[in-house]
């Protein structure tokens, strides 16, 4: 749902560098050989130095002289290495083994006209705890020109993604160009630049709780109802909806454009006895921004007359006539609001 974004490769928004580490910290990539040097002057020469890994008292070494060589280090070797002389601590050498971050793929969205834009990235593998992300941004508007700023990004363990909020006030008409910088102690990577317009980017979440049900006595009707997504507040901005439906065996949809703020609709031309796929999508009433994604598919089948068995076992009841076949069916069921059929049928 980010087809409205554009790349601006030529603009450099900020310098994306590896993170500084505390003085004396040794950094390494996994698999490397690392030399740790006990920092005290007294550790020089041929003295016997005792080393302990702070993460576990079981890992100990004794060296003659002040250097400890660790081969094929792994992420789990990260920690403090304590060197001691005569059972007294001489120094601590912090080791940080890390993997450089992967190149982030940034996507930005704004789910309603009242909220900030959110830019996020879901790494393909869990980043190391030391990995940090920052969003470099340039705001371009007609009045104030350009302004550069940075936004800190939080990593959510639950969502497994980095997320950054770009402040946009209601009614703002501004362009933003953004780039995500992800860095840790052994490397850094920037995403491609993404550009978005504060209003044009608005894209609601798909409508929620779509229900498709048969209407008794109506073999070609389907009643469809839904609700606005949780992320949309209909007391400020209304939504318009499109509904599309098709028989399960068809690829072609019939699309209906519905009046603003209508949360239900009756399909009148469903095929008898056939299961149909139905979806709905929403957009701000004044065509602000983008259509939402289509809601997940929900299926429904129109009402089917159940044949009654006579005592003789004959499967026919001449009095059972569908309402649809009667002359005055308009009066039998409250007529639904008229919908405009657009682009019907649509091949998707």
């Amino acid at each position: 749902h980010h087809h409205h974004h554009h790349h601006h490769h030529h603009l450099v928004l900020g310098s994306c560098r590896a993170l500084e580490v505390a003085n004396g910290t040794v950094t390494s990539l996994p698999g490397a050989t690392v030399t740790l040097i006990c920092p005290g002057k007294e550790a020089a020469g041929n003295v016997t130095i005792h080393w302990v890994y702070s993460g576990s008292q079981n890992r100990e070494w004794t060296t003659t002289g002040n250097t400890l060589v660790l081969r094929d280090v792994q992420l789990s070797d990260t920690g403090d290495y304590l060197c001691s002389l005569n059972d007294h601590l001489v120094g601590t050498v912090p080791l940080l083994v890390d993997v450089p971050p992967e190149e982030p793929k940034l996507s930005c969205f704004r789910k309603n006209p009242l909220v900030n834009a959110i830019c996020e990235w879901r790494p393909s593998s869990t980043p190391s705890p030391t990995t940090k992300a920052v969003l470099f941004a340039k705001k371009i508007n007609t009045t104030n020109g350009k302004s550069d700023f940075q936004v800190p990004c939080q990593y959510s363990q639950q969502l497994k993604s980095f997320s950054c909020q770009v402040e946009i006030l209601e009614g703002d008409k501004v362009y933003h160009i953004v780039s995500l910088c992800v860095a840790n102690s052994v490397g850094s990577k920037s995403s491609h630049n993404e550009a978005f317009h504060s209003l044009k980017m608005v894209q609601p979440d798909p409508p929620a709780n779509l229900v498709v049900s048969a209407i008794p006595g109506r073999p070609r009707w389907l009643k469809v109802s839904w609700q606005h997504p949780e992320t949309w507040d209909p007391s400020y901005y209304l939504l318009q909806f499109q509904l599309r439906y098709r028989p399960v065996w068809s690829k072609e949809f019939t699309v209906l454009l519905l009046p603003v703020a209508q949360y239900q609709c009756v399909i009148h031309d469903a095929l008898r006895g056939v299961k149909h796929v139905v979806q709905v999508r929403g957009k701000e009433e004044l065509d602000l921004g983008q259509w939402s994604e289509w809601s997940p598919e929900v299926t429904g089948t129109p009402w089917i007359a159940e044949p009654r068995t006579t005592p003789a076992g004959i499967l026919w009841n001449p009095t059972q006539v569908s309402v649809e076949d009667s002359a005055n069916h308009e009066d039998q069921y409250e007529s639904s609001t008229e919908a405009t059929s657009v682009l019907a049928p649509v091949q998707e």
């Epitope: 002057k41 007294e42 002389l85 059972d87 001489v90 120094g91």
Partner: antibody, heavy 116, light 107 residues
Framework: QSLEESGGDLVKPGASLTLACTAS?????????MCWVRQAPGKGLEWIGC???????TYYASWAKGRFTISETSSTAATLQMTSLTAADTATYFC??????????WGPGTLVTVSS | DIVMTQTPSSVSAAVGDTVTINCQAS??????LTWYQQKPGQRPKLLIY???TLASGVPSRFKGSGSGTDFTLTISDLECADAATYYC?????????FGGGTEVVVK
């Protein structure tokens, strides 16, 4: 092997004093930590600083920096120079060689009294 | 500087009792902690180094435990000779730091 402090005295506020720590049965040249600790009457132990013998490596408590200086004067002696003494510096001053598992040696201490 | 906080400042117990002295460091000192015993008018005597290793000649009634920031000295089967002041000490030459001391009175 033993250590002995000397030079403790009664001095006036503002005076300077140098204490000596002499080793018997071993020499400093093998690279020891020689440390000075003091104890005011009826109070606890307070670390002043250490020198790693055979080098110029010295460490001091933050309160002692500038006013106290530890030096190695020979292969068997170390000194503690104290300046601008006040009544709060009145204490027994110990020198110690602490080698953990290889033994721990403290002198008997020498008393410094600062009084007008 | 690292601060070593010792509790209690004084404890009274009968012969045969067990006494526990606590020492807390203001930051992680791993296992680099020493315990000393000092009797009035005497120099300090090393009891335990590296938090739990008994120094030569020290009875096994003395036991040190802990690592990181929290340490304990336990004296079991208390004897009259154990009446003294006990000090914990951060064991790093670049910065020794003593606790305030715990006076053990044997009744």
């Amino acid at each position: 092997q033993s250590l002995e402090e000397s030079g403790g005295d009664l001095v006036k506020p503002g005076a300077s004093l140098t204490l000596a720590c002499t080793a018997s049965g071993f020499s400093f040249s093998s690279g020891y930590y020689m440390c000075w600790v003091r104890q005011a009457p009826g109070k606890g132990l307070e670390w002043i600083g250490c020198i790693y013998t055979g080098s110029d490596t010295t460490y001091y408590a933050s309160w002692a920096k500038g006013r106290f200086t530890i030096s190695e004067t020979s292969s068997t002696a170390a000194t503690l120079q104290m300046t601008s003494l006040t009544a709060a510096d009145t204490a027994t001053y110990f020198c110690a060689r602490d080698l953990g598992s290889r033994g721990n040696l403290w002198g008997p201490g020498t008393l410094v009294t600062v009084s007008s | 500087d690292i601060v070593m906080t010792q509790t209690p400042s004084s404890v009274s117990a009968a012969v045969g009792d067990t006494v526990t002295i606590n020492c807390q460091a203001s930051e992680n000192i791993y296992s680099f902690l020493t315990w000393y015993q000092q009797k009035p008018g005497q120099r300090p005597k090393l009891l335990i180094y590296r938090a739990s290793t008994l120094a030569s000649g020290v009875p096994s009634r003395f036991k040190g435990s802990g690592s990181g920031t929290d340490f304990t000295l336990t004296i079991s089967d208390l004897e009259c000779a154990d009446a003294a002041t006990y000090y914990c000490q951060r064991n790093a030459y670049s910065s020794w730091a003593f606790g305030g001391g715990t006076e053990v009175v044997v009744k």
